[in-house]
């Protein structure tokens, strides 16, 4: 997955720090106070849709075969720049019953981006 | 994740059968001859971006908080209808050395769709 460097507009991973205070979640999230969530941004021209390295690669490569052949409805289906590899992160928070919970929350951090 | 029923244009899972013969892969894939790959289609209005049930939900909910507040650059970032749950499938095929391999291939079948 590409890291965005400002030079290309192809699908890439952009660094982004999330502050739980900014989004009003600091009342129930004890730790961390924020984290590098990152996000995906950029174009997905047909020639890079379903590019390998993406966790969606088999499925998206198959769909791309149909898309490239102008097969309805895939010809109009837009390929999207989306997270293809996400990582969990440990969090400490209050649950609904005000119990203190430490848990690995899945899919918190975007590690790689690709074209769906 | 919604199943597409033709009545809504909200992000949903559409049934789709892939024929390996159609895409010219039947020369190296022994079995199956095709499979229900499915795909994702539909709109992702801001109010359903990062909807729960999506494997991207924590990350996309966080990003959606910024998007809903018109935070640059998320205000212009398009939420996409993408696979959020994929399933592996067993395949029998020839590898590069013409050996017959049976293997579970990850991320072949779209089980659920959601808004990134």
């Amino acid at each position: 997955g590409l890291e965005c460097d400002g030079k290309v507009n192809i699908c890439c991973k952009k660094q982004f720090f999330v502050s739980f205070k900014d989004i009003g979640w600091n009342d129930w999230i004890i730790a961390p106070s924020g984290y590098h969530a990152n996000y995906c941004e950029g174009e997905c021209p047909s020639h890079i849709a379903g590019t390998s390295g993406s966790s969606l690669s088999f499925h998206s490569t198959v769909i791309n075969h149909y898309r490239m052949r102008g097969h309805s409805p895939f010809a109009n289906l837009k390929s999207c720049c989306v997270p293809t590899k996400l990582r969990p992160m440990s969090m400490l928070y209050y649950d609904d019953g005000q119990n203190i919970i430490k848990k690995d929350i899945q899919n918190m951090i975007v590690e790689e981006c690709g074209c769906s | 994740g919604l199943e597409c029923d033709g009545k809504v244009n909200i992000c949903c899972k559409k049934q789709f059968f892939v024929s390996f013969k159609d895409i010219g892969w039947n020369d190296w894939i022994i079995a199956p001859s095709g499979y229900h790959a499915n795909y994702c289609e539909g709109e992702c209005p801001s109010h359903i971006a990062g909807t729960s049930g999506s494997s991207l939900s924590f990350h996309s909910t966080v990003i959606n908080h910024y998007r809903m507040r018109g935070h640059s650059p998320f205000a212009n970032l398009k939420s996409c209808c993408v696979p959020t749950k994929l399933r592996p499938m067993s395949m029998l095929y020839y590898d590069d050395g013409q050996n017959i391999i049976k293997k579970d291939i990850q991320n072949m079948i779209v089980e659920e769709c959601g808004c990134s």
């Epitope: 600091n26 730790a31 961390p32 106070s33 919970i101 | -």
Partner: antibody
């Protein structure tokens, strides 16, 4: 480098309170939690609670709830632990420690000896 | 609260010996376990976290293993500076709890 410098030894009478300070340096104070752990003479380690300067939360072990107060002063990068209604069983060395990861204490202060005696 | 049980409570060994300390959790803590070394009159020092990851600067003769409920700290070749108390601690759930400690002393 990361350092946690604690206040000096204290001698207190039963029923009194003690306030121990822990000044940190070498990292951003609000980026990590400070845990407080005590050790009675010849005994093991006992976690008392923690303060999370980034989010403003404090969490305490049940045993100390109502008797301990953990505070912070972000202007001086200092954490405090106050224990009230002291008993002889509170005689111990009190350590502050930085949490590198949640509940994992990677850097420790040298400790503050608190003696409770009439 | 999760109970942590260490054994043995003390072990006598010589320089060069291989020493093994075990720690058992009262419930599954996956790999959320840390090991600390404490010398007399000193503060504890983190040796191992996530059950098997060596903290920066800790000699490679120290190693940790295990997951779930059973964990081990191994010192492959005991050095004079390794005579100390060792504590395991679970970091899986609130509140974090320590084992009772193991004293490694000179034979």
């Amino acid at each position: 480098q990361v350092q946690l410098v604690q206040s000096g030894a204290e001698v207190k009478k039963p029923g009194a309170s003690v306030k121990v300070s822990c000044k940190v340096s070498g990292y951003t104070f609000t980026s990590s939690a400070i845990s407080w752990v005590r050790q009675a003479p010849g005994k093991g380690l006992e976690w008392m609670g923690g303060i999370y300067p980034g989010s403003g939360h404090t969490i305490y072990a049940q045993k100390f709830q109502g008797r301990v107060t953990m505070t912070e002063d972000t202007s001086t990068d200092t954490a405090y632990m106050e224990l009230s209604s002291l008993k002889s069983e509170d005689t111990a060395v009190y350590y502050c420690a930085r949490e590198g990861d949640i509940f994992v204490m990677d850097v420790w202060g040298l400790g503050t000896a608190v003696t409770v005696s009439s | 609260d999760i109970q942590m049980t260490q054994s043995p409570s003390s072990v006598s060994a010589s320089v060069g010996d291989r020493v093994t300390i075990t720690c058992r959790a009262s419930m599954d803590i996956r790999n959320d376990l840390a090991w600390y070394q404490q010398k007399p009159g000193k503060a504890p020092k983190l040796l191992i976290y996530d059950a098997s990851k060596l903290e920066t600067g800790v000699p490679s003769r120290f190693s940790g293993s295990g997951s779930g409920t059973d964990f081990t700290l191994t010192i492959s070749s005991l050095q004079p500076e390794d005579f100390a108390n060792y504590y395991c601690q679970q970091a899986k759930s609130f509140p974090p709890t320590f084992g009772g400690g193991t004293k490694v002393e000179i034979k």
